[in-house]
């Protein structure tokens, strides 16, 4: 039975040209995290394997930095970066847990961070 929950940074906003940290945290399970995949709708951004390190997709390599931790830093944001991002935790023996983050990239200099929320 999958008992874990993923806590994410929730709905967040950031300024065009700036950067943002996408962060998820898996709790309430003793399952071992083998890797975390970061995806944006249909695209793979990066993979962090707990043992083998990071894979950064070539189409994002100039704008994505690994970390902190299992998180991902998106840089040089554009309005086109607005949308859903998913952290997919591959765990043993539980299986897969998915967290969702919605990022809005604003033209304006007013960019507020949304509250954290949990996905069971």
């Amino acid at each position: 039975m999958m008992t874990g929950t993923i806590e994410t940074t929730g709905n967040i906003s950031a300024e065009k040209g700036g950067s943002i940290i996408l962060q998820c945290h898996l709790s309430s399970t003793t399952a071992q995290v083998t890797q975390v995949n970061w995806e944006q709708q249909d695209q793979l951004l990066a993979i962090c394997n707990a043992d083998l390190g990071w894979h950064i997709s070539p189409s994002f390599k100039d704008r994505v930095a690994p970390g902190p931790g299992l998180g991902l830093t998106l840089q040089s944001l554009t309005v086109n970066d607005t949308g859903e991002y998913f952290c997919i935790y591959h765990t043993y023996p539980d299986g897969t847990y998915t967290g969702r983050i919605f990022l809005e990239v604003l033209e304006s200099s007013v960019a507020e961070h949304g509250a954290r929320f949990q996905i069971p």
Partner: antibody
Framework: QVQLVQSGAEVKKPGASVKVSCKAS????????MHWVRQAPGQRLEWIGG????????SYSQKFQGRATLTVDTSASTAYMELSSLRSEDTAVYYC????????????WGQGTTVTVSS | DIQMTQSPSSLSASVGDRVTITCQAS??????LAWYQQKPGKAPKLLIY???YRYTGVPSRFSGSGSGTDFTFTISSLQPEDIATYYC?????????FGGGTKLEIK
């Protein structure tokens, strides 16, 4: 230039162990994970596992968990793969191969080591 | 484990022909796919990474495309030196797995 040079062919009896080495040169050894892939005669390539020389973290295919052991000697820029409890089905060519910097594709390969298991 | 199904398993073509090999993953792997060329008695060589990026020094006649579960590897104009077995490889999640290979021969 990057080179991965493996140890020579081995003939082993069923139940024995084999340890294959892979000496890396031409790059910073700790910056790329090292993987082991085998190919039995006429078969597809099969991933055994990988090791991160930076922290000795290992990831194994479940099929080889407990039977394969991956290690590194960073001072000698050498990776090792030990396979125990050998059986005839383990007869194969064993390759060491490194993954690209910040990517998981396998960009350089050793020349292969033939391991024959026969009574 | 993710199964990789490659087709055809063998194919015969003439010099100058356009050759297409397909690889199907048993689940969505986004673009976490590479293609390798292996000649008899030799180690594999990386040709294409992340589904569509040509590796350094690989001739432009080799290309890859696809995302999700369906991928294609193409040789636009077959050359005699392209005779080899070609493999796809997924690294979306461990254990990493390979296709069964496509053996390419000259007619």
């Amino acid at each position: 230039q990057v080179q991965l040079v493996q140890s020579g062919a081995e003939v082993k009896k069923p139940g024995a162990s084999v340890k294959v080495s892979c000496k890396a040169s031409g790059y910073t050894f700790t910056e790329n994970a090292m993987h082991w892939v085998r190919q039995a005669p006429g078969q597809r390539l099969e991933w055994i596992g990988g090791i991160n020389p930076n922290n000795a973290g290992t990831s194994y295919s479940q099929k080889f968990q407990g039977r394969a052991t991956l290690t590194v000697d960073t001072s000698a820029s050498t990776a090792y793969m030990e396979l125990s409890s050998l059986r005839s089905e383990d007869t194969a060519v064993y390759y060491c191969t490194r993954s690209s910097y910040y990517r998981y594709d396998l960009d350089y390969w050793g020349q292969g080591t033939t391991v024959t298991v026969s009574s | 484990d993710i199964q990789m199904t490659q087709s055809p398993s063998s194919l015969s073509a003439s010099v100058g022909d356009r050759v297409t090999i397909t690889c199907q993953a048993s689940q969505d792997i986004k673009t976490a796919l590479a293609w390798y060329q292996q000649k008899p008695g030799k180690a594999p060589k990386l040709l294409i990474y992340s589904a569509s990026y040509r590796y350094t020094g690989v001739p432009s006649r080799f290309s890859g495309s696809g995302s999700g579960t369906d991928f294609t590897f193409t040789i636009s104009s077959l050359q005699p030196e392209d005779i080899a077995t070609y493999y796809c490889h997924q690294h979306y999640t461990t254990p990493w797995t390979f296709g069964g290979g496509t053996k390419l021969e000259i007619k």
